[in-house]
Every structure is written in structure tokens, then in C-alpha cells.
């Protein structure tokens, strides 16, 4: 019989280059069996992930794998930094590889990494 | 339960190339990533590269340019090809899948050993 | 690539006292750092991930702690099964181990 767990598919040291202003959702692909797990997104502070209860997520069913995603309407100056998603099954928790969120402040916009820089650093499997 | 089972020639001579194929069963390859570590005798840990569920592989850096790893998923194997095999590269070679967050090593096969020499 | 330094090379301990193994990274890894046992003739096995979360069917003797750079193995009282070589990993960026630390019995 397979082994059947949650498994969260955030590569390690993935990062995405956003704009502040802009719209964003940041995604943590998370494959399950049968009940979809518990799911939630921490934001990095220090030695801790503090978890980011008060903010807009939704669920996006694909056919292979779901999307937990974490929505930015919009994205802010200070939503720079890392995030982890993390998902309960079975009394246990298991927490993602960091996620990097550079955020470019509108006001210097002409530092915006190029569509070939980003296209170099793929920041997740599933897009 | 989870298993993992290496599988390789033994012997290579300086210069050529090793397939390795580890077999793995308990899980689908399209579920986990699995990683290519080796350990010469006596000696530590050195991570080789691993592949993704997608198919995408990570190598390390070091090595990049003589390695390769592929997977058939409907045959649950992993192949690991290393060209230009040198005295150095004598180790044993072990497959290890990743944990369900990809942040740890969880189950390990027993390895195969490799000698190279003439 | 980073570089996961480990002391001692080998440690002799007493039956029943503590083990304690480091582990420094070139550079910041937050907590993704694993430990792993090696016994004589095996290969690895996972004991802590996360940098301070026991693997299942882990003895709670077995404790990991640190985050950023440094990192520890402790083993409260050592157990005659507990003689192995132990390696940390860090899983940051691509991985790296440490050279292993040899727990002997003294």
C-alpha cells in the first residue's frame, strides 16, 4: 500500500519579484488523499513564523494538485520577506520551504528585475 | 511500507560512466522528490542531486556537468548517470526520498557501492 | 555553497550521560537543518528535522536545537545503540552535510 501524507511542493529557496501596488497571490501547491488538510501561511520574523491569521486565502482545485494561496489586493512595501506554508495532518505539522517575496516600491519601479531575470529563477513546481 | 533499492555494476573503469537505478515501492514518484547521495569509504555525506515530482532535477553545483538524473514514474525507478568517473568517485551511492515538505531525507535505501579502477 | 561545519570529529561519553554534537553554517540556514544516525554497515537514518523536531519513532533522548548558524545534537543519556556517527544537513539551498561526528562509548 502507498504512503499517503500531505505533501506541500514549495522547491527550497524560491523566490518571486513583485511590485508594490499590484495585485498578487502567492501560492503554496499541496497535494492530499483524502481530506484536505488544515493549511495555513506564516510570514518569517527572526527565529519565529508568525502566522498571518487575518488575511485573504482561498483554495484553487486543480486536477492533480489544490493551490492554498495567500492573496496581496495589493501588494504593500513592507510584505517584502519570506513565507512558509504549513498544513496539520495527523498531528502532525509539516512546513514548507520558504518562499521569497522581493517587493519593488512603485516610486523606484525601474528596478524591476527583467521577464528574463525571472524566467531564471522559476520560484515554484506548479505555476 | 516505504522501500528503496540501489542498484548498480560494481566495478567501473577510470573514465567511463556509471548508470545506477534505484527502485523504489510504498510511494509513486509522482508524489516525491527523490535525492542521489554518495559516501566514499570511511568518509562523510555528499549530496549529488535530486529530482522533482515534476521531472525538474537540482544537481550540485560541483558535479553538474557530469551528472544526470532521470525517472520513469510507471516504473517507479530513479536513474543517476555520472560520466567520467575517476579513483575519487569510488563510494557507496544511495537514493533517499524526500521528506512530504522536501526539507529532510526520510527513508534511505542500503546503497550500492561502486568501485572505480582498472 | 554553504558549509555545515561539525564538532567534535568523535566523542567518547559515558553510558548514561550527555552527548552533545555542533553544528555551525557558513551562513544563515533559519531551521532547515537535519540530523541524521549512521550506524556501522548502514545507511543514514533521519532523527531530527526542522532543526528541532523528532522523527517519528525517534527516542525523546535524541534533542536537536538552534536556528540561523548554530545547531546541536543532544543525547540526554546515552544508550549502548546510540554508538553511530551522526551528520547534520542543512537543506536551506542546495544540500550539504557536515563531516559526521563519531559517538563512541567511553
Known amino acids: 500500500k502507498e504512503s499517503c501524507d500531505v505533501q506541500l511542493y514549495i522547491k527550497r529557496q524560491s523566490e518571486h519579484s513583485i511590485l508594490a501596488g499590484d495585485p498578487f497571490e502567492l501560492e503554496c501547491p499541496v497535494k492530499y488523499c483524502a481530506n484536505r488538510p488544515h493549511v495555513t501561511w506564516c510570514k518569517l520574523n527572526g527565529t519565529t513564523c508568525v502566522k498571518l491569521e487575518d488575511r485573504q486565502t482561498s483554495w484553487k482545485e486543480e486536477k492533480n494538485i489544490s493551490f492554498f494561496i495567500l492573496h496581496f489586493e495589493p501588494v504593500l512595501p513592507n510584505d517584502n520577506g519570506s513565507y512558509r506554508c504549513s498544513a496539520n495532518f495527523q498531528s502532525n505539522l509539516i512546513e514548507s520551504h520558504s518562499t521569497t517575496l522581493y517587493v519593488t516600491d512603485v516610486k523606484s519601479a525601474s528596478e524591476r528585475p527583467s521577464k528574463d531575470e525571472m524566467a531564471s529563477r522559476p520560484w515554484l513546481l506548479y505555476r | 511500507q516505504v522501500q528503496l533499492k540501489e542498484s548498480g555494476p560494481g566495478l567501473v573503469a577510470p573514465s567511463q560512466s556509471l548508470s545506477i537505478t534505484c527502485t523504489v515501492s510504498g510511494f509513486s514518484l509522482t508524489g516525491y522528490g527523490v535525492n542521489w547521495v554518495r559516501q566514499p569509504p570511511g568518509k562523510g555525506l555528499e549530496w549529488l542531486g535530486m529530482i522533482w515530482i515534476d521531472g525538474s532535477t537540482d544537481y550540485n553545483s560541483a558535479l553538474k556537468s557530469r551528472l544526470s538524473i532521470n525517472k520513469d514514474n510507471s516504473k517507479s525507478q530513479v536513474f543517476l548517470k555520472m560520466n567520467s568517473l575517476q579513483t575519487d568517485d569510488t563510494a557507496r551511492y544511495y537514493c533517499a526520498r524526500d521528506r512530504p515538505d522536501g526539507r529532510a531525507m526520510d527513508y534511505w535505501g542500503q546503497g550500492t557501492s561502486v568501485t572505480v579502477s582498472s | 555553497s554553504i558549509v555545515m561545519t561539525q564538532s567534535p570529529d568523535s566523542l567518547a561519553v559515558s553510558l548514561g550521560e550527555r552527548a552533545t554534537i555542533n553544528c555551525k553554517a557558513s551562513?544563515?540556514?533559519?531551521?532547515?537543518v537535519a540530523w541524521y544516525q549512521q550506524k556501522p554497515g548502514q545507511s543514514p537514518k533521519l532523527l531530527i528535522y526542522y532543526a528541532s523536531n523528532r522523527y517519528t519513532g525517534v527516542p525523546d533522548r535524541f534533542t536537536g536545537s538552534g536556528y540561523g548558524t548554530d545547531f546541536t545534537l543532544t543525547i540526554s543519556s546515552l544508550q549502548a545503540e546510540d554508538v553511530a556517527v551522526y551528520f547534520c544537513q542543512q537543506d536551506y539551498s542546495s544540500p550539504t552535510f557536515g563531516g559526521g561526528t563519531k559517538l563512541e562509548i567511553k
Open positions: 551562513q544563515s540556514v533559519s531551521n532547515d
